[in-house]
């Protein structure tokens, strides 16, 4: 089975790498524009230069292309706690990230929010906090993990999942009470 190619991919595949087929004349292959530039005018003929212009401030192209417009630079989303790691240049989009001791949680492919790394109070660090993952905590005896915090088993209600984790503790307490002096 031959995979279906879009019109642009079909046109590009006729020309050697780094070139694209002229939209009005499919016998001409024009040189693609370098990153940081965009297509202003197609090449007039074979072996002639493509008219590429540099992206204006606030826009970029990150790879060779034949785009009629540069792409708009991304903005870091303050409401999501994002900070700018590096600003946009003509050939690279803005890079956004999180502050120190924070991690990224991706709500979708192109949206992340910064959250504070868990400190594992009443527990120990099983896996350290990473760029895209919170600390993994292991709780001390008598505590259970809820929303990545170690919470006392005294806050465990019967209906919650914690009953399995806190049950040995509860049984130990009962056992101590039952073994009274005779």
């Amino acid at each position: 089975l031959v995979p279906h190619l879009g019109d642009r991919e079909k046109r590009d595949s006729v020309c050697p790498q780094g070139k694209y087929i002229h939209p009005q004349n499919n016998s001409i292959c024009c040189t693609k524009c370098h990153k940081g530039t965009y297509l202003y005018n197609d090449c007039p003929g074979p072996g002639q230069d493509t008219d590429c212009r540099e992206c204006e401030s606030g826009s970029f192209t990150a790879s060779e292309n034949h785009l009629r417009h540069c792409l708009s630079c991304s903005k870091c989303r303050k409401e999501m706690g994002q900070v700018e790691i590096s600003s946009c240049t003509v050939d690279r989009d803005t890079v956004c990230g999180c502050r120190k001791n924070q991690y990224r949680h991706y709500w979708s492919e192109n949206l992340f929010q910064c959250f504070n790394c868990s400190l594992c109070l009443n527990g120990t660090v099983h896996l350290s906090c990473q760029e895209k993952q919170n600390t993994v905590c292991t709780c001390h005896a008598g505590f259970f993990l809820r929303e990545n915090e170690c919470v006392s088993c005294s806050n465990c209600k019967k209906s919650l999942e914690c009953t399995k984790l806190c049950l040995p503790q509860i049984e130990n307490v009962k056992g101590t009470e039952d073994s009274g002096t005779t």
């Epitope: 989303r77 409401e79 999501m80 949680h105 709500w107 929010q113 959250f115 929303e147 990545n148």
Partner: nanobody, 119 residues
């Protein structure tokens, strides 16, 4: 006590429009980023859109960009979602929520309103 109450859902034909509302109380609405999420039958939660407190530069998921518009009226403590050019795949329960602060879960979100897109 934080309360979020959605309304405006219903049955609509493909290509049709709906406007969802979310009435908020129990917190300072004008200080909070508000979110619309949806859950299609048998699927997980999907982030649809969010809007910062000042209403500037809202975010839209690629799946709704150009069709949905989020807005807010801070004087009425109300969040809106205008949904145009609706498709069958937009069928879901739509919830409004406060942007999470402590971790990647929703502490405060509404019961939701069902949107069904079908001919």
């Amino acid at each position: 006590e934080v309360q979020l109450l959605e309304s405006g859902g219903g049955l609509v034909q493909p290509g049709g429009s709906l406007r969802l509302s979310c009435a908020a109380s129990g917190f300072t609405f004008a200080h909070e980023t508000m979110v619309w999420v949806r859950q299609a039958p048998g699927k997980g939660l999907e982030w649809v859109s969010h809007i910062p407190p000042d209403g500037q530069d809202p975010f839209y998921a690629d799946s709704v960009k150009g069709r949905f518009t989020i807005s807010r009226d801070n004087s009425k403590n109300t969040l809106y979602l205008q949904m145009n050019s609706l498709r069958a795949e937009d069928t879901a329960v739509y919830h409004c929520a406060l942007l999470p602060k402590r971790g990647p879960w929703f502490d405060y979100w509404g019961q939701g309103t069902l949107v069904t897109v079908s001919s």
